[in-house]
């Protein structure tokens, strides 16, 4: 039960006090007791319950009422059973007793009131009225946890607007209200109660720029909502009528968890005694609700696809046809960004990452816009954000970014268990340098901080700075699987490729050509590739880099070797010893459920079939996956990217609720 106020009683004049239902009020009977009195007894109206604790127990008088010694060991507390119909309608009488004097009486007139701030602290999607209870003030994780949840109102329900809904202090319509969390103030008081008392709703100054509270007046219509708390307003006096009354508030978060904001927001209602005009108002009671701002959550390849994004650029019609066909097979919506909007920037994966935010009453997809800001920079904000589609960005918006700030360098694993630690929403993966040096590339600290602050997908730093482009999607991917952990990790593997080519040469296919059918490309015989010592040395270095990540992933994701599939792939070291794919990088694939769009490798044709394609199919088809090889050679591969780099996917949110985990 919540702590109420302390009431001091005195025999000199009657005391008037307010007692909030659900709170425990302390009664100070000792400090004003007559000097020659040594004990006291208590009589109350039926609506008041008094509890007296003392060691040793008191003696019972023959009249039936008990007396207690007047000493500091006595604790008197009272609670009220119901709200008062009129002011002071409940009474407590303290009788002080002494050996030589008649009893001296002290009177306490109590007014019982109900004042409670409620929100969906049980996370059921409904607000249940709660009396003032201690546990509303704490937010706990896990299936038995409690505490309310707020969404950042980061979508744009008004198609005419260019701003996010949380950037204005208006409620557009009932759709906009659904992005907010309901909070209800319930009051039950005597009719004249608020002539002498006032309620104030407030938020800490340190949190005021993270939240906005709208008060719904006269019904719940959006047009009747007005801002009462927000970035410019940490407190608001409430006009509350006497009697029984419910007041609804709609709460929106304005900021995601981040370095200096753990995501918790406390809203408090304070009851002030304003009865003495010449004196400052005194706090009589406070009730609070703690909200946690819902984190931004990424979705792995194992989640069902819902929408595919791709760019239309000069001469990529065939690529578009292939992606369109794949999206149709996977029953996905397809969104094509036209040339006039992408400004010759085809790297859809690098521009954005689509995740979601979730509260018990609402789930919202949210696009995380990377700070790379090339030709596609307007696409997330102008074409993706919209009604029920949120937006967030981090990092410098002008300069100061590296290639590692593009979101081909941001992936997430499927759910994993590492020892005793469960990651039911998977773990974020991003690439970094091995160690900081004058020219090493890292993901911008603002991005790293944001990702870590979400708490629910603890990030893992991989090593990717050895690549020309430097993105994790150049050497890893995840595909769904029907067994084991429900997925396989795919890793690019020069070792596996050399093994395959060696086998083909041993079988007499050393003259088979890589890049057959590619115009203006020097075709390479298997035997020449195998005998090129420089290329072998380069791939030995690449293998070491990938193996470093392999061990890191096994450790951080709790994987065994049998959870990993090696995809044959060769790399070449280019300027400044940075690696890029020697032939189209097959691990850089588009995963749409069981349908995979894999870069066509143009490997050696043996018995009428590309041996690289055949090998990959033999590895993935037993998992129930369907491999489609997409020609991206001229439009993507020679520009340092592949199918995954050129596409993006919105996926179905997890069925697992983030608040049920323990980070």
């Amino acid at each position: 039960m919540a702590q109420g106020t302390l009431i001091r009683v005195t025999p000199e004049q009657p005391t008037h006090a307010v007692c909030v239902l659900g709170t425990l009020t302390q009664l100070d009977v000792c400090s004003s007791a007559p000097e020659d009195c040594t004990s006291f007894s208590v009589n109350t109206s039926p609506g008041v319950v008094v509890d007296i604790a003392h060691s040793p127990p008191a003696k019972k008088k023959s009249t039936g009422s008990s007396t207690w010694p007047l000493d500091p060991g006595v604790e008197v507390t009272l609670t009220m059973k119901a709200a008062s119909g009129s002011t002071g309608d409940q009474k407590v009488q303290i009788s002080y007793h002494g050996p030589k004097t008649p009893p001296v009486k002290a009177l306490l007139y109590l007014t019982g009131v109900e004042i409670s701030l409620s929100a969906d602290i049980t996370r059921t999607g409904k607000v249940k009225p709660t009396r003032a209870v201690e546990d509303k003030r704490t937010w706990t994780w896990g299936p038995c946890g409690q505490g309310a949840i707020l969404l950042v109102n980061c979508d744009r329900d008004n198609p005419e607007s260019s701003a996010m809904d949380c950037e204005d202090d208006e409620v557009l319509d009932s759709k906009d209200l659904k992005d907010m969390s309901l909070m209800t103030l319930s009051t039950k008081t005597p009719q004249d109660f608020f002539t002498r008392h006032t309620l104030v709703l407030h938020v800490a100054r340190s949190e005021m720029d993270k939240v906005r509270v709208f008060q719904a007046t006269r019904g719940r219509l959006s047009s009747r909502c007005r801002v009462v708390l927000g970035p410019k307003q940490p407190s608001h006096y409430l006009m509350v009528p006497g009697g029984k009354h419910n007041m609804d508030f709609y709460v929106e978060a304005l900021a995601f968890p981040d370095t200096n904001f753990p995501g918790l927001i406390t809203l408090t209602v304070s009851m002030l005694d304003t009865s003495k005009l010449e004196l400052p108002e005194a706090v009589v009671f406070q009730d609070s609700v703690v909200f946690r701002v819902a984190p931004w959550i990424m979705t792995p390849n194992t989640q069902p696809p819902q929408e595919v994004y791709v760019c239309s650029i000069f001469e990529n019609e065939d690529f578009l046809k292939s992606v369109t066909a794949l999206a149709m097979q996977a029953r996905c919506k397809l969104t094509i960004c036209p040339e006039e909007e992408n400004m010759d920037d085809q790297w859809m994966q690098d521009e954005m990452e689509i995740g979601y935010i979730q509260a018990p009453h609402k789930t919202l997809p949210v696009v995380f816009d990377s700070p790379r800001n090339r030709g596609l920079k307007e696409f997330p904000i102008k074409r993706v954000m919209g009604p029920d589609f949120g937006y967030v960005t981090r990092g410098p918006q002008t300069g100061g970014v590296s290639g590692l700030d593009s979101f081909g360098n941001l992936e997430v694993s499927p759910p994993v268990t590492v020892g005793d630690k469960e990651y039911p929403l998977g773990r974020i993966l991003f690439g970094d340098s091995c160690y900081p040096s004058s020219d090493s590339r890292e993901m911008h600290q603002a991005l790293q901080d944001f990702l870590s602050a979400q708490q629910v997908q603890a990030p893992v730093k991989l090593y990717s700075d050895w690549l020309t482009v430097g993105h994790v999607d150049e050497f890893l991917s995840f595909v769904p699987a029907p067994d084991r952990k429900g997925f396989r990790l795919l890793l690019a593997s020069p070792r596996s490729c050399y093994k395959l080519f060696q086998e083909q040469q041993n079988e007499g296919h050393g003259d088979a050509l890589l890049f057959q059918g590619i115009k203006k490309k020097n075709q390479q015989k298997i035997k020449n590739i195998l005998s090129n010592t420089t290329l072998r040395e380069h791939n030995s270095f690449v293998e070491r880099c990938i193996d470093w990540n392999r061990e890191l992933l096994k450790r951080e994701l709790g994987l065994a070797e049998s959870d990993i599939i090696d995809i044959p792939q060769l790399f070449k070291l280019k300027e400044f010893s940075k690696a890029e794919a020697f032939f189209p990088n097959m691990v850089n694939m588009l995963v749409l459920g069981k349908h995979l769009g894999i870069p066509k490798p143009f490997g050696p044709i043996i018995n009428g079939r590309c041996c690289l394609e055949e090998k990959v199919c033999s590895l993935l088809e037993p998992l129930g996956l369907h491999c489609t090889f997409i020609n991206d050679f001229y439009t993507y591969h020679i520009r340092h990217g592949e199918v995954h780099c050129g596409t993006n996917v919105r996926r179905k949110p997890f069925s697992f609720k983030w608040w049920n985990m323990v980070p």
Epitope: R374, S402, G403, S437, S438, D439, R441, T468, V469, G470, K520, K521, N522, Q524, N532, T534, L535, H538, K572, L573, K574, E575, F576, S577, K578, F582, I638, R639, H640
Partner: antibody
Framework: QVQLVESGGGLVKPGGSLRLSCAAS????????VSWIRQAPGKGLEWVSF????????YYADSVRGRFTISRDNAKNSVYLQMNSLRAEDTAVYYC?????????????????????WGRGTLVTVSS | QSALTQPRSVSGSPGQSVTISCTGT?????????VSWYQQHPGKAPKLIIY???ERPSGVPDRFSGSKSGNTASLTISGLQAEDEADYYC???????????FGGGTKLTVL
């Protein structure tokens, strides 16, 4: 073959900033590595900065690191050198140079380390 | 002070051969085969004449040749001509924090 033209040079006070541009014609600059080289009056060549064709990594000389930023806009067929906190010793003719990033290369041909096409240069004078 | 060391000047008569040396360390010239040479006439932009130690871009006469031994690279110009009079700079990839280094330049005078 690509032709390069530098612009943006001029007189600036110590501590000031300038942004040099290198515009390409005759070919698509996105296929080229680009470097900036400078030459102080009467002195030798000094390598300043490099950006790769994919626009994914950059390098700088110790003497300019943290003050200069190289960037490219392939849509505009241009490369830029943003120079901040300029010092008297940055006074020089700044050359933009490039080398083709040939996808046919099997192994590192060193194209990022040599400059086969040069612009005419733009003079930057840092003086109070 | 330049990172790669070249003689300040060399000279030769028309028809003769001259060699310009470029000395670095085991972290640049000695480590990589990414040595290049540039010719610069007064008031003009430099011009690439040798790359990757000994390769010549198209249009560069075969009188210009490059070589490397240990930490020293060399440019040899045979059959000197009057138009060869210019400044010559060597350059190398380096594993230091400045990844491309130039020599201080050598003034070639054709007598």
């Amino acid at each position: 073959q690509v032709q390069l033209v530098e612009s943006g040079g001029g007189l600036v006070k110590p501590g000031g900033s300038l942004r040099l541009s290198c515009a390409a014609s005759g070919s698509t600059l996105s296929d080229y590595f680009v470097s900036w080289i400078r030459q102080a009056p009467g002195k030798g060549l000094e390598w300043v900065s490099f950006i790769n064709s994919a626009n994914t990594f950059t390098y700088y000389a110790d003497s300019v690191r943290g003050r200069f930023t190289i960037s490219r806009d392939n849509a505009k067929n241009s490369v830029y050198l943003q120079m901040n906190s300029l010092r008297a010793e940055d006074t020089a003719v700044y050359y933009c140079s490039s080398a083709n990033d040939d996808v046919d290369d099997i192994v590192a041909p060193g194209r990022g380390y040599y400059m086969d096409v040069w612009g005419r240069g733009t003079l930057v004078t840092v003086s109070s | 002070q330049s990172a790669l060391t070249q003689p300040r000047s060399v000279s030769g008569s028309p028809g003769q051969s001259v060699t310009i040396s470029c000395t670095g360390t085991s972290g640049d010239v000695g480590r990589y085969n990414h040595v290049s040479w540039y010719q610069q006439h007064p008031g003009k932009a430099p011009k690439l004449i040798i790359y990757n130690v000994y390769e010549r871009p198209s249009g560069v006469p075969d009188r210009f040749s490059g070589s490397k031994s240990g930490n020293t690279a060399s440019l040899t110009i045979s059959g000197l001509q009057a138009e060869d009079e210019a400044d010559y700079y060597c350059s190398s990839h380096s594993r230091s924090s400045t990844p491309v280094l130039f020599g201080g330049g050598t003034k070639l005078t054709v007598l």
